[in-house]
Interface confidence: low
């Protein structure tokens, strides 16, 4: 899904830093300035457009160390591995002077037999394998350490985890004469976790467990393991907190059912059913507790291990998930929707924004996409004017220094927040829609009506006139 | 950077017509739905017309129709607004803006170009 | 046509206190949770300068001293604290349907 949304709105870049002075020549000394600003409450607003403001004055002083990247570290323990036996490992950016750690897991789908994982293994191989993997990696999004880009968590140090189990970060089983692939995404996190430790973990206040896709239900599948590790490990003080994007999936019925062949048509409870055998998943222990031995697929699911769980989570979530729709069999090519297709489109809708009813940290725009949280631009969606990073600020202060979010939401700062409207992109700030097969852009109003949704409806949020929608329908302006 | 300029303001007489250009720079410009609004000496902000990124809807102020025709080249990045039937009350900086996908709302202004109608 | 309502006319303020200016609409232009409501400022001899965009959005650049809220037909520019370079001219406008309308405009001084 790379590469798929135009984010930005368009011709509209952040200011480059201001450059007023002189870099520092390269090898002399630079003071450096540790902050961290967990405990900063009241006027946040306020405080992060001064903050920002200074860290963008001193870009100048600092040209030289301010480096985005991350670097990759492969696991000292070199059983814990990926698919084809090669070492794991992670990318780290390190920020000494904060208190908050970031550990984001990669998200890529899975495979769940032999055969699609060899298919896997000669079309994706960086998904299955340590050895091609860059020695460096840019932080984006979430992960970046520019307050521009990232004005939820700059300052924290950042973790990136690739994924290369393609067992949805549960699998519990190393490579052997017996098995061609290792499935180690469950250790792979308690390896990690381990190891940081040892590079500055052990002073954390607060761990961010995230991920996106097959990574954002990793979250929710480990989430409370890394908390009990750490735990175990003598650091009960830290807190554990998760943030899954666009890992909430539905077992519901598929558009048009079909027999389960691969890993994109395979109906997704079917799918993880066998993966779960063929990986020896591991799922949280509370969840597994709750139902029948062979019906632990059942919580891989969001809305059935979410009650389960005991660290805080916010959920992220496109109520028209492009992964959603693709295991449902539903493929938007751009040719006009048959009645049929658009009830199901809007009940997916419908049923995903009623499964967050109960989660309070919500984010779920009515946008058709997919992941979110690394995109540099993460900070242009919003739900009822409120963006993503402004959402997660406010469950951050929502949570104070406990582990349970407290149940009256802050005035003026929601985390709660899904958009209510019923069709996609019927919220302005979706990014925008590309065909799935050709990759061009698609004007929205062209996608709705193709959709067949009925023109007044349409037109009124887009705020055009049934008119003037009628005439971009038939240019695709 | 994006930028746009407008010109072809001049003095003109009562009844008379005058034809404003808008260039457009640093963005697609055949990507935006652009429009043509006007401000009179010392009064607020006025619509005066929309055209499509394709050109294929037109929309104009009630007082301006059948006398402003807005219409864009988008392979020259350029915003036309021929004005014929002049009236006194049609004096004022006249400015092109893009408007932006996500709301209507106008993200980029021209710096204006001043059309005076007198006799 | 909506009418957008904008009041006061003119407005006095002290160096660093608040500014509130309101921009009432003739009907809702509220839809499915958005507000097609902005707001710009205008210096002399320069064209409009967009500041808030959906009631409630900062735009790139503007200063977060800037603040916009509402819904329906109700909405609220505030500025604090107000500085010497905020003193200009200041517009509301709906996009809620075609055509877009103007505020007739709130001239902030500072004292």
């Known amino acids: 899904s790379e590469g798929r949304k135009t984010w930005r709105r368009r011709g509209q870049q952040p200011p480059p830093p201001p450059r007023t002075e002189a870099a520092p020549a390269a090898g002399q000394p630079v003071e450096s300035f540790p902050l961290d600003f967990t405990a900063v409450e009241g006027n946040m607003d306020s405080f992060m457009a001064q903050v920002k403001s200074l860290a963008q004055s001193l870009y100048p002083c600092s040209a030289q160390q301010l480096n985005e990247d991350l670097r990759l570290h492969l696991l000292l323990n070199t059983s814990v591995t990926c698919n084809d036996g090669s070492p794991a490992g992670y990318y780290l950016k390190e920020s000494r002077g904060s208190r908050r750690w970031l550990l984001f897991l990669e998200g890529g789908w899975y495979c769940f037999n032999r055969e699609n994982c060899d298919s896997r293994y000669d079309t994706m191989r960086r998904l299955m394998s340590s050895r091609d993997w860059p020695r460096t990696r840019t932080g984006t999004g979430i992960l970046s350490s520019q307050p521009e880009e990232n004005p939820y968590w700059w300052n924290a140090n950042m973790v990136f985890i690739p994924y290369c189990s393609s067992d949805v970060w549960s699998g519990a089983s190393s490579k052997s004469e017996k098995n061609e692939y290792a499935f180690m995404g469950a250790l792979i996190i308690q390896e990690v976790v381990r190891e940081l430790l040892g590079r500055g973990l052990s002073g954390a206040k607060v761990l961010l467990l995230a991920g996106s896709s097959a990574g954002g239900t990793g979250v929710l599948l480990n989430v409370d393991r890394v908390a009990e590790q750490l735990e175990k490990l003598g650091y009960p003080a830290i807190q554990v907190r998760g943030l899954a994007d666009s890992g909430w999936f539905l077992d519901n019925k598929q558009y048009r059912h079909t027999d389960c062949v691969d890993t994109i048509t395979c109906a997704p409870t079917e799918a993880i059913r066998r993966g779960i055998r063929y990986w020896n998943g591991v799922v949280p222990e509370r969840c597994r507790r709750q139902f029948q031995e062979g019906e632990e697929w059942n919580c891989f699911f969001g809305y059935k291990v979410y009650p389960t769980l005991r660290c805080p989570v916010f959920v992220v979530q496109w109520l028209f998930d492009e992964a959603q729709l693709t295991v449902d069999n539903v493929h938007l090519t751009g040719q006009p929707v048959q009645e049929g297709l658009r009830l199901y489109i809007q009940n997916l809708g419908r049923e995903l924004r009623h499964t967050l009813k109960d989660v309070p940290a919500s984010f779920a725009p009515a946008c058709l996409s997919h992941e979110i949280i690394i995109r540099s631009h993460w900070t242009d969606v919003q739900v009822k004017g409120t963006s993503l990073p402004r959402a997660l600020h406010c469950w951050d202060r929502s949570l104070h220094d406990s582990h349970k979010a407290s149940k009256t939401p802050l005035k003026g700062c929601p985390v709660h927040l899904v958009d209510s409207c019923p069709w996609p992109h019927c919220n302005p700030s979706c990014p925008t829609v590309r065909d799935q097969f050709t990759g061009q852009e698609m004007n929205v109003a062209q996608f709705l009506m193709h959709m067949g949704f009925d023109m007044q409806t349409v037109a009124q949020p887009q705020g055009l006139e049934p008119s003037e929608l009628l005439g971009m329908l038939s240019n695709g302006s | 950077e994006v930028q746009l300029v407008e010109s072809g303001g001049d003095l003109v007489k009562p009844g008379g017509s005058l034809k404003l250009s808008c260039a457009a720079s640093g963005f697609t410009f055949s990507d935006y739905g652009m429009h043509w609004l006007r401000q009179a000496p010392e009064k607020g902000l006025e619509w005066v017309a929309y055209?499509?990124?394709?050109?294929?809807?037109?929309s104009y102020a009630n007082t301006m129709k059948g006398r402003f025709t807005i219409s864009r080249d988008n392979a020259k990045k350029t915003l036309s607004l021929q004005m014929t039937s002049l009236r006194s009350e049609d004096t004022a900086i006249y400015y092109c803006?893009?408007?932006?996908?996500?709301?209507?709302?106008?993200?980029?202004w021209g710096t204006g170009t001043t059309v005076t109608v007198s006799s | 046509d909506i009418v957008l309502t904008q009041s006061p006319a003119s407005l006095v303020v002290s160096l660093g206190q608040r500014a509130t200016i309101s921009c009432r609409a003739s009907k809702s232009v509220s839809e499915s949770g958005y507000s097609y409501m902005h707001w710009y400022q205008q210096k002399p001899g320069q064209p409009p300068k967009l500041l808030i965009y959906?009631?409630?959005n900062l735009e790139s650049g503007v200063p977060a001293r800037f603040s916009g809220s509402g819904s329906g037909t109700d909405f609220t520019l505030n500025i604090h604290p107000v500085e010497e370079g905020d003193a200009t001219t200041y517009y509301c406008?709906?996009?809620?349907?075609?055509?877009?309308?103007f505020g007739s405009g709130t001239k902030l001084e500072i004292k």
């Open positions: 055209i499509s990124s394709g050109s294929t809807t037109l």
């Open positions: 406008q709906h996009s809620r349907v075609l055509p877009p309308t």
């Open positions: 803006a893009r408007k932006n996908y996500n709301g209507g709302y106008f993200d980029v």
């Open positions: 959906l009631a409630s």
